[in-house]
């Protein structure tokens, strides 16, 4: 897999896409999760609903939302109100038993609010949250890394 | 292996400028944020400025806004901190890191770089 | 800004002894917290993320718990390596502080 930058700015919100073949992977949930580290776990942020049909139904993990259109074959999060600590390193999965398979790899970039004038170092941060924090779209640019540049491993 | 060089340290004068550099190899640079971490002279660590991937945003902690300038070239996987006003209490051992991205953690650190504010 | 503080300042323990030295954060960070090692003439290297997380070719003696304010770091069966300055870091929000630092020292 090569990796997908989708950029952000702080107070506003993302959507990423992952697109997938709709026919390898059907009747599988999916998941969004966060490499916590290089090698480190791949932590559960939000999945799919627990009945496959009701996919669509978008569901919520505080600012993270999930919804997948099982015909089409794309899985879209939203990431709301983003948050510098929004940042990272996730993986769009498809379940399958315990297992998961990695459908894209996506490193999640903040860039501070171009026209709020306080520094950069003033940006407001809410209160700690074990989750990765609370959750429209209005702000998306992605780009796909070159393939063989990712020194990311997959899922521990 | 991942590597961070730095290098630009030195000896300068209250209110004068320095720039360091960092030099990165052994991962793709263009995919992590990366920052500068200080270490007075037999003291603690303390961060001093992290970089998005891109370069399009920066942090800094408040003691060196306004003063300190981060930037990174990812076509030649360089980083960059160009000090300016310096201050006697700047003086500290500066090291690059490899910052976790939205984690804020640093998982590999250069061997550091000297810089001595003194008149 | 969160103050992280660490005790003991130093402690001097045998080859083989259990030790755990503590972090205290100002208020409550979750299980947001990383420990470094820095040992004498270097630079430091990340030891845990995520309270508990261990890096890349960090040895299974050290350990890591703790929540909210009140964390731990415990090496078990120290070893002549591990000599060192530890310290504590809170993540994942700006800005990103770290304890005093502990010395660990070998009879």
């Known amino acids: 897999h090569n990796t997908t930058v989708f950029q952000g700015v702080a107070g506003q919100s993302l959507q990423v896409s992952c697109p997938y073949d709709s026919m390898k992977h059907w009747g599988r949930r999916k998941a969004w999760c966060r490499q916590l580290g290089e090698k480190g776990p791949c932590q559960r942020v939000v999945s799919t609903h627990n009945l496959w049909l009701l996919s669509f139904l978008r569901r919520w993990n505080g600012s993270t939302a999930i919804t997948d259109d099982t015909l089409g074959g794309t899985l879209t999060i939203t990431l709301r109100n983003l948050q510098p600590h929004d940042a990272g390193l996730y993986q769009c999965q498809s379940l399958h038993g315990s297992e998961a398979d990695t459908l894209r790899k996506v490193l999640v970039e903040v860039l501070a609010d171009p026209l709020d004038h306080r520094d950069a170092g003033d940006l407001w941060f809410p209160g700690e949250s074990e989750s990765f924090e609370d959750a429209h779209v209005e702000h998306s640019i992605s780009r796909s890394l070159l393939e063989g540049e990712i020194p990311f491993p997959p899922t521990s | 292996e991942v590597q961070l060089v730095e290098s630009g340290g030195g000896l300068v004068q209250p209110g004068r400028s320095l720039k360091l550099s960092c030099a990165a190899s052994g991962f793709t640079f263009s995919n992590y944020y990366m920052a500068w971490v200080r270490q007075a002279p037999t003291k603690g660590l303390e961060w001093v400025a992290s970089l998005t991937n891109s370069g399009g945003s920066t942090y800094y902690r408040d003691s060196v806004k306004g003063r300190f300038t981060l930037s990174r070239d990812n076509a030649k996987s360089t980083l960059y901190l160009q000090m300016d006003s310096l201050r006697s209490e700047d003086t500290a051992t500066y090291y690059c890191t490899r910052e976790w991205a939205g984690s804020g953690y640093f998982d590999y650190w250069g061997q550091g770089v000297m810089v001595t504010v003194s008149s | 800004n969160i103050v992280m503080t660490q005790s003991p300042k130093s402690m001097s323990l045998s080859v083989g002894d259990r030790v755990t030295m503590n972090c205290k954060a100002s208020?409550?960070?979750?299980?947001?917290l990383a420990w470094y090692q820095q040992k004498p003439g270097q630079s430091p290297k990340l030891l845990l993320y995520y309270t508990s997380n261990r890096f890349t070719g960090v040895p299974d003696r050290f350990t890591g718990g703790g929540y909210g304010t009140d964390f731990t770091l415990t090496i078990n069966s120290v070893q002549a390596e591990d000599a060192a300055f530890y310290y504590c870091q809170r993540i994942y929000n700006s800005p990103w502080t770290f304890g005093g630092g502990t010395k660990l020292e070998l009879k």
């Open positions: 208020q409550n960070v979750g299980n947001n």
